[in-house]
């Protein structure tokens, strides 16, 4: 025999206190898929979550995060403070990066600058909190009679169109 | 199990600072929403602001311009301070967790267990 | 002020089913979810239903809730001596961005 909840579509659970028909989702609840017997409630996306997404009959709400903070976890579970460009979260909130170490973004660890050394060439340009430093040619391209080189654009954030 | 004490002093003067602290135990103060909820003697229950645990206030518009909630994650603490109190502010002082963003559904579920604080000379 | 409204007290016979009522607006009930909080004298509030009629885990089913537009209500079925305490109401309100309550209801078990 065909379980009668089988044919109650998303949107709609199959309500056992009404001989199993197929009742529609209370407000602030949802479900997603066909046969359910219970609809599960909306996410709510309050105080540092912003709606990017209502929630319907048959879908979640979808939450991202108040200007100044950025999603984590899985579906934006939860906001994490922005910082600025050069510095690092912290428990004690925003620090700069040490020396010898920068971060490019608002989120995310300070990292070590590039150790140009390594792979045999000489440092062009500097590092900074915000920036990496730059490698240069070899040592040894830099000779009396080595073409001259020209040093690379700066690396532009993605979505930012030249000044 | 999440617990939740609250500490500081009971008595405070008039035109002076309400500072207290609430201290969590039994689990982790991220990825919730920590509150402070105070309810004058024989009245209701009033928000006066809440915390997300990396950093985001909210304040009831009525104090905002006297409270401050901070947190300091790495103590598994948050703190109010509440600036210029009168005897209105008298009141059972309440620290809570509130899980209603991000996943979260049951709102204001973990309190503790209230401190009393007067205003008075 | 209380921003909800409840009525300030109810009463009923053991064994008897009570209602308590909330109303708000628009920007409180009428868009979220209510919780419904109980509190014995000298002690803290308690979650009793929360997302309208949602029962926390160890909480009865004696215990409902239910909301309708702007207006929400608790039903307590088969009243008992130890139901004697103040009922709260709550709602996030999208204005005020943050939870406001209603004034408490006390329950008196005649």
């Known amino acids: 025999l065909q379980d009668p909840c089988s044919n109650c579509p998303a949107g709609t659970f199959c309500d056992n206190n009404r001989n199993q028909i197929c009742s529609p989702c209370p407000p602030n609840s949802f479900s997603s898929a066909g046969g359910q017997r219970t609809c599960d409630i909306c996410r709510q996306c309050k105080g540092v979550f912003r709606t990017r997404k209502e929630c319907s009959s048959t879908s979640n709400a979808e939450c991202d995060c108040t200007p100044g903070f950025h999603c984590l976890g899985a579906g934006c579970s939860m906001c994490e403070q922005d910082c600025k460009q050069g510095q690092e979260l912290t428990k004690k909130g925003c620090k700069d990066c040490c020396f010898g170490t920068f971060n490019d973004q608002k989120r995310g660890i300070c990292r070590p600058w590039t150790n140009c050394s390594l792979d045999g060439k000489s440092v062009l340009v500097n590092g900074t909190k915000e920036r990496d430093v730059v490698c240069g040619p070899s040592p040894a391209d830099l000779s009396p009679g080595a073409s001259s080189v020209t040093p690379p654009a700066p690396a532009r954030e993605p979505g930012h169109s030249p000044q | 199990q999440v617990q939740l004490q609250e500490s500081g002093p009971g008595l405070v003067k008039p035109s002076e600072t309400l500072s207290l602290t609430c201290t969590v135990s039994?689990?982790?103060?991220?990825?919730?929403?920590w509150t402070w909820i105070r309810q004058p003697p024989g009245k209701g229950l009033e928000l006066v602001g809440y915390?997300?645990?990396?950093?985001?206030?909210s304040y009831n518009p009525s104090l905002k311009s006297r409270v401050t909630i901070s947190i300091d994650t790495s103590k598994n603490q948050f703190s109010l301070q509440l600036n210029s109190v009168t005897a209105a502010d008298t009141a059972v002082y309440f620290c809570?967790?509130?899980?209603?963003?991000?996943?979260?559904?049951?709102?204001?579920?973990?309190w503790g267990q209230g401190t009393t604080v007067t205003v008075s000379s | 002020q209380s921003v909800l409204t409840q009525p300030p007290s109810a009463s009923g016979t053991p064994g008897q089913r009570v209602t308590i009522s909330c109303s708000g607006s628009?920007?409180?009930?009428?868009?979220?979810?209510v919780n419904w909080y109980r509190q014995l004298p000298g002690t803290a509030p308690k979650l009793l239903i929360y997302?309208?009629?949602q029962r926390p885990s160890g909480v009865p089913d004696r215990f409902s809730g239910s909301k309708s537009g702007t207006s929400a209500s608790l039903a307590i079925s088969g009243l008992q001596s130890e139901d004697e305490a103040d009922y709260y109401c709550?709602?996030?309100?999208?204005?005020?961005?943050?939870?406001?309550f209603g004034g408490g209801t006390k329950l008196t078990v005649l």
């Open positions: 709550a709602a996030w309100d999208d204005s005020l961005n943050g939870w406001v």
């Open positions: 809570a967790r509130d899980d209603y963003g991000g996943n979260g559904y049951y709102g204001v579920d973990v």
């Open positions: 039994g689990g982790s103060i991220s990825s919730y929403y």
């Open positions: 997302s309208n009629n």
């Open positions: 628009s920007s409180n009930i009428g868009n979220n979810p």
């Open positions: 915390i997300y645990y990396s950093g985001y206030t």
